[in-house]
Interface confidence: medium
């Protein structure tokens, strides 16, 4: 999916993986983005290598709820924030108007079944305009050195682990074939690099109730949630994880 | 339902400005995301952007920015897209079109037809 | 942007004849963010299909959706004279908005 890379800076796509064995997978952020006072920016999760089912999506800001994307349910916007986010695009959530107090921790809050809660953080800082702009300017500069310094620190990696195999080979000269007819077997069976998001399988998730692991609230609480607040659904999440 | 009403065709010249307007009625307007949308003659559908009339919040495809400007009057839940400094390339029919907290334009205004002609 | 292609851009069918017209994405979205409207000349388009295979209200049950990732069909069991019109795929899943380019579809 491109959308999950929609506003990514140069650290690149952020990954929550989580502790737990059984729970296989992962929260792709935006990470940690910046934005001009007054503008807005989208924010977007992602949920990857699982084919649990997504039951729903909340957006936190510290702890404070901001919107809930429901599977049977659709959205709701919490109304102290309804004229300044936006729903979407996809299961993203639009900030807009924003200001210096918006600067914080973001959170998005898979819940499925059977994984149980995935959680992933956006860092978002709002920078007043020129502060913005200033920051543009040595971005690039940084970017360009950081680049160079890359390069440089490759190229020695790859002239040592040459020369290191260089010396390998005279000694294990008499095994080459042993080895190559083991190394032949195990391109065989080798998991692939992972594929870069919008090729990987999409698994479409089914509903399967409003109970995820909600935070110190139970089941009987939640749906006093949706039944107090005034619930809006024209039309359903996009519910889906992508298995890669 | 919301039902969206569209102003009347509008000839303009080159470099003037346009405001056209899309009237809401049967729904809680304020809470519906009215869509503008750009179809040139014999050709497909192109998104401008949106306006929340609750707060007035805009979001635009990057390639209108400074090209339109969308405004709400609650008092009378209507939405206006001002176009600026107009050229043929903005001769088309501008569609407004609504969406709640779904996914899809399920309300669709009938449609307002630019033309700009010295 | 995400860039949707549509095949064929122009086709005539026979009263009776199964029509598929399809939609390609560029970059894999989830179905629910796949939408199609039709558009008769003169008139502005309707809600057809959204995510992926819901008909909207009061379309015929002669129409289908389907498809997943990048690849999105839009399809007419049996093909009538009132279903001659302009067909739209639209994606919501990232911003810009995105349509396809439309498919024309006559009858024979």
């Known amino acids: 999916m491109r959308w999950c890379l929609l506003l990514i800076w140069a650290q690149g796509l952020r990954q929550a993986p989580l502790a737990s064995g059984m729970m296989t997978g992962t929260i792709e952020t935006t990470g940690n983005i910046s934005a001009e006072k007054g503008g807005s920016i989208i924010l977007q999760c992602h949920l990857s290598s699982t084919t649990a089912q997504v039951t729903q999506v909340n957006w936190e800001q510290q702890d404070q709820l901001l919107a809930i994307c429901n599977a049977d349910l659709g959205w709701h916007i919490s109304p102290s924030f309804k004229d300044r986010v936006a729903p979407g695009p996809g299961l993203g959530l639009t900030l807009q108007s924003l200001t210096v107090n918006d600067t914080g921790e973001y959170f998005c809050i898979y819940h499925t079944y059977p994984d149980g809660t995935y959680t992933g953080r956006i860092f978002l800082e709002v920078l007043e305009s020129s502060v913005a702009e200033h920051g543009a300017r040595f971005q690039i500069p940084l970017l360009g050195a950081m680049a160079a310094t890359l390069v440089v620190i490759c190229t020695a990696v790859i002239v040592v682990v040459a020369l290191t195999r260089k010396k390998k080979a005279l000694r294990i000269h008499s095994v080459e074939g042993d080895l190559r007819r083991k190394s032949a077997g195990q391109e065989e069976w080798s998991p692939s690099a992972p594929s870069p998001p919008g090729s990987c399988v999409q698994a479409e998730a089914a509903p399967a109730g409003l109970c995820g692991e909600q935070r110190g609230e139970d089941c009987a609480e939640l749906h006093d949630y949706f039944n107090v607040l005034s619930y809006r659904s024209l039309g359903n999440c996009s519910f889906f994880t992508e298995t890669g | 339902q919301v039902q969206l009403q569209q102003s009347g065709p509008e000839l303009v010249k080159p470099g003037a400005s346009v405001k056209i307007s899309c009237k809401a009625s049967?729904?809680?307007?304020?809470?519906?995301?009215i869509n503008w949308v750009k179809q040139r003659p014999g050709q497909g559908l192109e998104w401008i952007g949106w306006?929340?009339?609750?707060?007035?919040?805009?979001y635009f495809n990057e390639k209108f920015k400074g090209k339109a400007t969308l405004t709400v009057d609650k008092s009378s839940s209507t939405v206006y897209m001002l176009l600026s400094s107009l050229t043929s390339e903005d001769s088309a029919v501008y569609f407004c079109?609504?969406?709640?907290?779904?996914?899809?334009?399920?309300?669709w205004g009938q449609g307002t037809t630019l033309t700009v002609s010295s | 942007e995400i860039v949707l292609t549509q095949s064929p851009a122009l086709m005539a069918a026979s009263p009776g004849e199964k029509v598929t017209i399809t939609c390609s994405v560029s970059?894999?979205?989830?179905?629910?963010?796949l939408h199609w409207y039709q558009q008769k000349s003169e008139t502005s388009p309707k809600p057809w299909i959204y995510?992926?295979?819901n008909l909207a209200s009061g379309v015929p049950i002669r129409f289908s959706g389907s498809g997943s990732g990048t690849s999105y069909s839009l399809t007419i069991s049996s093909m009538e004279a009132e279903d001659a019109a302009t067909y739209y795929c639209q994606q919501w899943s990232s911003y810009p908005l995105t349509f396809g380019g439309g498919t024309k579809l006559e009858i024979k």
């Open positions: 049967g729904h809680t307007f304020t809470d519906y995301y």
């Open positions: 995510g992926t295979s």
């Open positions: 306006i929340f009339p609750g707060s007035g919040n805009t």
């Open positions: 079109a609504g969406y709640g907290l779904g996914h899809y334009f399920d309300n």
């Open positions: 970059s894999s979205i989830s179905s629910s963010n």
